[in-house]
Amino acid sequence: IIDGAPCARGSHPWQVALLSGNQLHCGGVLVNERWVLTAAHCKMNEYTVHLGSDTLGDRRAQRIKASKSFRHPGYSTQTHVNDLMLVKLNSQARLSSMVKKVRLPSRCEPPGTTCTVSGWGTTTSPDVTFPSDLMCVDVKLISPQDCTKVYKDLLENSMLCAGIPDSKKNACNGDSGGPLVCRGTLQGLVSWGTFPCGQPNDPGVYTQVCKFTKWINDTMKKHR
């Protein structure tokens, strides 16, 4: 997260980290006791999922292995359209004050809405500084028309843009798959942006979760 600050302790109990061994790979969100939602470009063969603490490496955190993941069938490694994936935990997460399910959206929020993006990704770019504490930054949803002015044909229908004019505030590497939460509901998953991260007027691009609630629910049912 670029130009952010540590999240208020326990304010993101649905935030998870996907680890490869002990190394941060991506962010994600807990949908229910068995399922984590993240970005399709975060696909690995096996995951260790960190839940229940804002601090990576916290011994009090839950760590659960996951071996099965289901990319959206329409994901493209070229255009990055449909960049979302469900990861099935090998054992159930224990819900608590620090481990809660995210609220999936019942509607798509409009441009101008203030949202929070969070993650343990690098806080500097191109030189990297990985924080141990979960970082947050507030950004505003940007209309597809305005975002297309920046990204032209790279922007697809189910992509959502967010940023602050003339500001560095943005996601970065390691934040992928993590949540963009607006008015208490999950509206986006960190997908991509320009490099170095945090270039003013280059919005962050997110998978627009409100377009995929049916696929999310259907996939969890199908692979119960």
Epitope: A39, T77, H80, T122, F195
Partner: antibody
């Protein structure tokens, strides 16, 4: 300003191992989120990618050379290295090291262009 | 592997000419294409990244376009220092990273 400099023997015997080092100055190989790349160019021919290594020391190799190639990083010396085993005359080329600049973050991070290059070093394979 | 085919392999042009070089990928690579210039005895130099973005410090007479499988590098008004060989390169998410065969721009 970042600079890259290749070094290593200019002559290698057939069946031996070619070893080259790229020294990075003006930037830190251990803290910058770039790819570090080896490319070669046989005399009078085009460019061929050998392989790359990233910030996490993950390596990516050209399948046609994979069984013979090792790329590694020495962060204490701000260097990355190439080893190519069992060389033949076909491995005679100018060898370049370069920095791969990602085209984006997240889903666009694994795509890159080489924005800084060493001047190249000529390696001849001959007995 | 994705094959990158450049055309023409060589061309002769005069100072001030508009020059166009094309690069075709054997399958779609979205906008993940870069262009390089190489002068004899020198290392390649990045001109264009992501199909159409001009690398910092590169003169604006160079431009790139295209998406999917067909790409173009255009030099709007050829200068004496532009006589060189030009290569396209497909970004390496689709390994291996591959270059086109090159286009040599010579003085007419």
């Amino acid at each position: 300003q970042l600079q890259l400099q290749e070094s290593g023997p200019g002559l290698v015997k057939p069946s031996e191992t070619l070893s080259l080092t790229c020294t990075v100055s003006g930037g830190s190989i251990s803290s910058d989120d770039y790819y570090w790349v080896w490319i070669r160019q046989p005399p009078g021919k085009g460019l061929e990618w050998i392989g790359s290594i990233d910030y996490f020391a993950s390596t990516y190799y050209n399948p046609s050379l994979k069984s013979r190639v090792t790329i590694s990083v020495d962060t204490s010396k701000n260097q990355f290295s190439l080893k190519l085993s069992s060389v033949t005359a076909a491995d005679t080329a100018v060898y370049y090291c370069a920095r791969g600049r990602p085209l984006g973050y997240g889903a666009r991070h694994d795509y890159y262009g080489m924005d800084v290059w060493g001047q190249g070093t000529t390696v001849t394979v001959s007995s | 592997d994705i094959q990158m085919t450049q055309s023409p392999s060589s061309l002769s042009a005069s100072v001030g000419d508009r020059v166009t070089i094309t690069c075709r990928a054997s399958q779609s690579i979205s906008s993940y294409l870069n262009w390089y210039q190489q002068k004899p005895g020198k290392a390649p130099k990045l001109l264009i990244y992501s199909a159409s973005s001009l690398q910092s410090g590169v003169p604006s007479r160079f431009s790139g376009s295209g998406s999917g499988t067909d790409f173009t590098l255009t030099i709007s008004s050829l200068q004496p220092e532009d006589f060189a060989t030009y290569y396209c390169q497909q970004s390496p998410y689709f390994p291996p990273l591959t270059f086109g065969g090159g286009t040599k721009v010579e003085i007419k």
